[in-house]
């Protein structure tokens, strides 16, 4: 999450010993309060591994460290999904999995983690400095995204930091460690607050920036607990982007937007953009490959072209993705 909260600046205390001590005891509670507020913030981890057997084959593993239920997971490369990245796979916990080349196999590992194997050959195969991103959506609470890539000096078979091999144990140790520190911090904060209970409250100085806190992104929840999680995105090396699988629409807008009804409630079903036959029941999909329809089994890859939904001010390159016309 990248929701930001503004903390009002405190009026500096009077100089002198009391002022210096007062300043320290005033700053510390704010720091501890921020830690306490963000203690329950869900996080996403990403592990990128190059297979020793196939040098250009990658395994991406992603996990969600949070208590909320996941409604959708999107894996992309070349940057965050929706910001120039190309979608590789979309996983729904109940309805199935859809994936696009060069993704070979996407699957759920646990209820909160997924893995994706990428094909090792072809023009669209990844290379060592490709950035992979995972976005976990929990509708309507919010969505959390993190990115990772192989370190430049990675040997085949080695996984990218920061996630060690026994992920579950490492995560657990981290959670316990951080929880311990935060618990101590929260207790200390309460102690400080009780000590300062009878002192006059410091005057709050309005923040120099806009009085209104910046609104979270469209998908971000408006919870204060999401305040301090800033996911650093790795720099995208454009020379190592996947091959242009999709072509942007010449007019910049989505090719299907104009075909949607402007007033009528029900329109007759015309020729579909990617599957004119009715979509089968849960657990079964219509796959479109080379213009041929094929009925697939339970949770197969859904290699279907899509359409760009919205225009992009940055031009055609940003429109690359599973929604371009193949």
């Amino acid at each position: 999450m990248r929701t930001e909260a503004q903390v009002p600046a405190l009026q500096p205390p009077e100089p002198g010993l009391e002022g210096a001590m007062g300043h320290r005891t005033l700053v510390l509670p704010w720091v501890l309060l921020t830690l306490c507020v963000t203690a329950g913030t869900p996080e996403v981890w990403v592990q990128v591994r190059m297979e020793a057997t196939e040098l250009s084959s990658f395994t991406i593993r992603c996990g969600f460290l949070g208590s909320g239920s996941i409604s959708l997971v999107t894996v992309s490369w070349g940057g965050p999904n929706g910001a120039g990245g190309t979608t590789l796979a979309v996983l729904h916990p109940e309805r199935g999995i859809r994936q696009w080349a060069p993704a070979r196999q996407a699957r759920w590992e646990t209820q909160s983690s997924i893995s994706l194997i990428l094909e090792g050959s072809g023009a669209s195969s990844p290379c060592a400095n490709t950035t992979f991103c995972c976005k976990f959506a929990s509708f309507p609470e919010g969505s959390w995204e993190a990115c990772g890539s192989l370190p430049p000096s990675s040997d085949p078979g080695l996984s990218a930091p920061p996630t060690p091999a026994p992920i579950l144990r490492a995560d657990l140790a981290g959670i316990l460690g951080v929880s311990g520190v935060l618990l101590f911090g929260c207790v200390y904060l309460l102690h400080l607050l009780r000590r300062h209970k009878h002192r006059p409250a410091p005057r709050l100085q309005p923040s120099r920036t806009s009085p209104q806190a910046p609104r979270a992104r469209a998908w971000a929840p408006s919870q204060a607990s999401q305040a301090a999680l800033h996911v650093p995105y790795a720099t995208i090396n454009t020379s190592c982007r996947p091959a242009t699988l999709d072509t942007a629409h010449p007019h910049g807008g989505p090719s299907w937007w104009a075909s949607l009804p402007t007033h009528a409630a029900h329109r007759p079903q015309g020729p579909a953009a990617w599957a004119s036959t009715p979509i089968p029941a849960r657990g079964s999909f219509v796959s479109v490959e080379n213009g041929l329809y094929a009925q697939a089994g339970e949770r197969p890859p859904h290699t279907g072209p899509g359409l760009t939904l919205f225009p992009d001010p940055r031009g055609p390159r940003a429109m690359e993705g599973p929604l371009g016309v193949r």
């Epitope: 409604s71 959708l72 999107t74 992309s76 999904n81 929706g82 910001a83 120039g84 990245g85 190309t86 979608t87 979309v90 729904h92 309805r95 199935g96 859809r98 976005k135 959506a137 509708f139 309507p140 969505s143 469209a218 998908w219 989505p254 299907w256 075909s259 949607l260 009804p261 409630a265 029900h266 329109r267 079903q269 015309g270 579909a272 953009a273 990617w274 599957a275 004119s276 009715p278 979509i279 089968p280 029941a281 849960r282 657990g283 079964s284 999909f285 279907g304 899509g306 359409l307 760009t308 939904l309 919205f310 992009d312 001010p313 940055r314 940003a318 429109m319 993705g321 599973p322 929604l323």
Partner: nanobody, 121 residues
């Protein structure tokens, strides 16, 4: 990131009408469906009040068929939901969302902050 901003919610009497709007802006969204979802107070999220996929197929929840109409603005990227003959059970936070189709259902990947619709006399 794609930004979806809903508007048009409010308080309306039973039998009344409201028109919700969803303005889409920002970067490319890589999905294949859009629609309106709602969450009633103390209840779970509805599968999808009204959704459109990239083939132009429209799907309505049984509870709103014949009363709600989903449509779009051609020039600007705006999605609408015309709600007529509103009932008390339509009271909810309505979300505009864009996502991916699974088994004929639109699963949200990006959504707005929601707009409150209250149907009460």
């Amino acid at each position: 990131e794609v930004q979806l901003v809903e508007s048009g919610g409010g308080l309306v009497q039973p039998g009344g009408s409201l028109r919700l709007s969803c303005a889409a802006s920002g970067f490319t969204f890589s999905g294949d469906c859009m629609g309106w979802f709602r969450q009633a107070p103390g209840k779970g999220l509805d599968e999808g009040v009204a959704t459109i996929d990239n083939a132009g197929r429209i799907k309505y929840a049984d509870s709103v068929k014949g009363r709600f109409t989903i449509s779009h603005g051609n020039a600007k990227y705006i999605l609408y939901l015309q709600m007529n003959s509103l009932r008390a059970e339509d009271t909810a936070v309505y979300y505009c969302a864009a996502g991916w189709t699974f088994g004929g259902q639109c699963s949200p990947a990006d959504w707005g902050q929601g707009t409150q619709v209250t149907v009460s006399s």
